[in-house]
């Protein structure tokens, strides 16, 4: 499947080979189930598409950090 654009419901079987601009990312979820062949991150883009990515890649880690910061509520 081109660019691993199609994220299965629970597992990823291949990863995108293309970095996605962080501005195009809306959210992510981690796939850590032992039933899956590999750990993965599924990003959801602004246009609602899902993409499987390798959590070991720096751009993936940076993107998750960025999204985490966006969703953090300000401390009072």
């Amino acid at each position: 499947q081109p660019d691993a654009i199609n994220a299965p419901v629970t597992c990823c079987y291949n990863f995108t080979n293309r970095k996605i601009s962080v501005q195009r990312l809306a959210s992510y979820r981690r796939i850590t189930s032992s039933k899956c062949p590999k750990e993965a991150v599924i990003f959801k883009t602004i246009v609602a598409k899902e993409i499987c990515a390798d959590p070991k890649q720096k751009w993936v880690q940076d993107s998750m950090d960025h999204l985490d910061k966006q969703t953090q509520t300000p401390k009072t």
Partner: antibody
Framework: QVQLVQSGAEVKKPGASVKVSCKAS????????LHWVRQAPGQGLEWMGW????????NYAQKFQGRVTMTRDTSISTAYMELSRLRSDDTAVYYC??????????????WGQGTLVTVSS | DIQMTQSPSSLSASVGDRVTITCQAS??????LNWYQQKPGKAPKLLIY???NLETGVPSRFSGSGSGTDFTFTISSLQPEDIATYYC?????????FGQGTRLEIK
């Protein structure tokens, strides 16, 4: 070569439903999103939503939520768009269109020939 | 929803003329914009993607430019086969929206 072949023209009465098919060939059906776009007579293009044939995920334009259902049958590489509670202003040519495989982008590199749906009492 | 406004809605030009169509977005869409050509009775055809990239197989007389809210589509030398309606389409966000179209005729 890539082809999207749609079902034939339909005439429906107000309140009825219509189901349009889009048969894909020449590429891996589960590898690309398929969108539905309609065009009323003499009017512009209107996006209705997409289906991800790989996992059956869908995303519908809010305007059509509750009235449209997009499905697929991977065994015959065919996508379907069903629109219910038809009104006269649903009279349009309905197109399926393949979305190039880029996660953050949406552009349509191949289109079906279109299916004219006429809603008339 | 992001509104896309094309101008003019129709235009008439002579073979060999340079033709320009503009598309304005209701908010900043960076370069997330595509252009399509639709001939009468046919499905649309992708010409330009990401504001300025020519789709494979499309003649080089077609070009696109712009970013943010203002975009331009140009035919450098109009050919008889270019008679069609042209649409811009944004994908900055859902829902995907199109301009209302520009109908191009030969004088």
């Amino acid at each position: 070569q890539v082809q999207l072949v749609q079902s034939g023209a339909e005439v429906k009465k107000p309140g009825a439903s219509v189901k349009v098919s889009c048969k894909a060939s020449g590429y891996t059906f589960t590898g690309y999103y398929l969108h539905w776009v309609r065009q009323a007579p003499g009017q512009g293009l209107e996006w209705m939503g997409w289906i991800n044939p790989y996992n059956d995920g869908t995303n519908y334009a809010q305007k059509f939520q509750g009235r449209v259902t997009m499905t697929r049958d991977t065994s015959i590489s065919t996508a379907y768009m069903e629109l219910s509670r038809l009104r006269s202003d649903d009279t349009a040519v309905y197109y399926c269109a393949r979305d190039i495989a880029a996660a953050g982008a949406v552009y349509f590199d191949y289109w079906g020939q279109g299916t004219l749906v006429t809603v008339s009492s | 929803d992001i509104q896309m406004t094309q101008s003019p809605s129709s235009l008439s030009a002579s073979v060999g003329d340079r033709v320009t169509i503009t598309c304005q977005a209701s908010q900043d869409i960076t370069t997330y914009l595509n252009w399509y050509q639709q001939k009468p009775g046919k499905a649309p055809k992708l010409l330009i993607y990401d504001a300025s990239n020519l789709e494979t197989g499309v003649p080089s007389r077609f070009s696109g430019s712009g970013s943010g809210t203002d975009f331009t589509f140009t035919i450098s030398s109009l050919q008889p086969e270019d008679i069609a309606t042209y649409y811009c389409q944004q994908y900055d966000n859902l829902p995907i929206t199109f301009g209302q179209g520009t109908r191009l005729e030969i004088k």
